[in-house]
């Protein structure tokens, strides 16, 4: 009976292992809701903090400085391409059972079903595995306890200037400088209009309930938790890794439905600074508090 046997050959005709896509999406949603959610939902404050931490809460000005002493021929741009496929094996690597098949490329018709999965995803709280059920429910890991409230310290009128300093090894370092700027940059606070699923707590009650398992103990991180320290660093997944970890083939085009499964992982990876190497301040040529960009796409 097909249910109880999984052949080594590809299992999903469409090229996606939906069970894996759903479970992996849920995993990343849990990570995000653990850091920013409360009571299985994402408050406006939490959503604002998430946007702030991934750097899309306000306008940024980027200055690229070409240090010709180190790169007289402007080679440094090509460095972005250098870190191709880092083969990582995290606890989240599930290759054994996701086999891929030919994609009937149901390349989503016109409306291409945008599954509210991504942001909508678990934003509302209880039912989401996948989009809530996958679905929309904010599932927080059982160990999540109360969340530390962190006051917004940056107003919408501030601008962040990002400077890329090229270092001799050819690595790019990102330096972010908060620069208060007078004047209104937005017609309204960028986070005042959040996705419906993020703010609709009413959905929580009509979705599944969630219990927490007190047996799992892990300190809850505040919004500004320190990222990628030695404890359990998250991997920097390139495109191939992101796809395979969600049970998707890497040779077939993605439709909107499939892309939606990837949204939480992409946001989580940005938020966790998985692709930034926090360089040691001991290196003389590197200013304190800078991040090395590890581009893995």
């Amino acid at each position: 009976f097909p249910q109880t046997t999984e052949k080594i050959s590809p299992n999903w005709e469409s090229g996606i292992n939906v069970d894996l896509a759903i479970s992996t999406r849920q995993y990343h949603l849990q990570q995000l809701f653990y850091r920013y959610g409360e009571n299985n939902s994402l408050s406006v404050e939490g959503f604002r903090k998430l946007l702030q931490n991934i750097g899309i809460d306000k306008i940024k000005r980027i200055h690229i400085h070409h240090d010709h002493d180190h790169h007289s021929d402007h080679e440094h741009h090509s460095d972005h391409e250098r870190h191709s496929d880092h083969e990582h094996h995290s606890e989240h690597e599930h290759h054994s059972d996701h086999d891929h098949h030919s994609h009937h490329n149901h390349a989503a018709s016109g409306k291409n079903k945008r599954k509210a999965l991504c942001p909508d995803h678990d934003s509302d709280s209880s039912g989401k595995d996948p989009r809530n059920s996958q679905g929309k429910g904010a599932h927080r890991p059982e160990h999540a306890s109360g969340r530390r409230n962190v006051k917004d310290s940056v107003s919408a009128s501030e601008v962040t200037s990002t400077v890329y300093n090229t270092v001799s090894e050819g690595t790019h370092f990102l330096e972010t400088i908060e620069t208060p700027r007078p004047g209104k940059l937005f017609p309204k606070d960028v986070s005042s209009s959040t996705p419906p699923s993020v703010t609709s707590k009413s959905r929580v009650s009509r979705l599944a309930g969630r219990k927490t398992n007190e047996s799992v103990s892990e300190p809850r991180k505040g919004f500004m938790y320190s990222r990628n320290t030695n404890e359990n660093p998250q991997e920097c997944f390139n495109a191939s890794k992101l796809l395979t970890s969600h049970g998707m083939g890497i040779q077939v085009p993605l439709n909107a439905t499939e892309f939606n499964y990837l949204c939480p992982a992409i946001i989580n990876q940005i938020d966790a600074r998985s692709c930034l190497i926090h360089t040691s301040e001991k290196k003389a040529e590197i200013p304190p508090k800078t991040y090395s960009l590890q581009i893995a796409w």
């Epitope: 999984e6 069970d19 479970s23 059972d97 945008r114 989401k128 429910g137 890991p141």
Partner: antibody
Amino acid sequence: QVQLVESGGGVVQPGRSLRLSCTVSGFSLTTYGIHWVRQSPGKGLEWLGVIWTGGTTDYNAAFISRLTISKDNSKSTLYFQMNSLRAEDTAVYYCARGPSSYWGQGTLVTVSS
Amino acid sequence: EIVMTQSPATLSVSPGERATLSCKASQNVDTNVVWYQQKPGQSPRALIYSASYRYSGVPARFSGSGSGTEFTLTISSLQSEDFAVYFCQQYNNYPWTFGQGTKVEIK
């Protein structure tokens, strides 16, 4: 080869608790979430809850007060406990790996005095 | 919770004919719908997921379509082994919910 096998069904008296197990093979519980579904002549198929890879759980709100799903990754086994059983809980209980074709064979639970 | 309503409850079809089963959701579930086939004494077997994707091993005569609130499972030419009960299920919102089933019987 993916397999899910439920056990623990049988006759249970009203008001008592039910504890079922689901042992999986061919994949890891740290990779896939596992769902519990039941089927009865009166109510058809009902989704009861899920336990995700990290151990978090989501339950059908109609059962949250009397249902607990847990697991032991090292034993590749899930546990399903429902309290305060009543006659209408009589059904075949399944564990399944998401909306896929991987379901256990089911175990019949009869609530009767 | 989202209510999935299937119609008809029973469909009488002759072998070789086309069968069209309908499933309607009480609210938008995007394309997060699975169709199952169940025969007496067996577990449900998934045929289609994401509304229109066929699982491997499922004959090409089975096809699914729809999005939002209306979904259809079509069996282009019924074979003797296709007479069974078919369920739709949404996995867009919790709790995941199933239709009450459509029994496809021999005419």
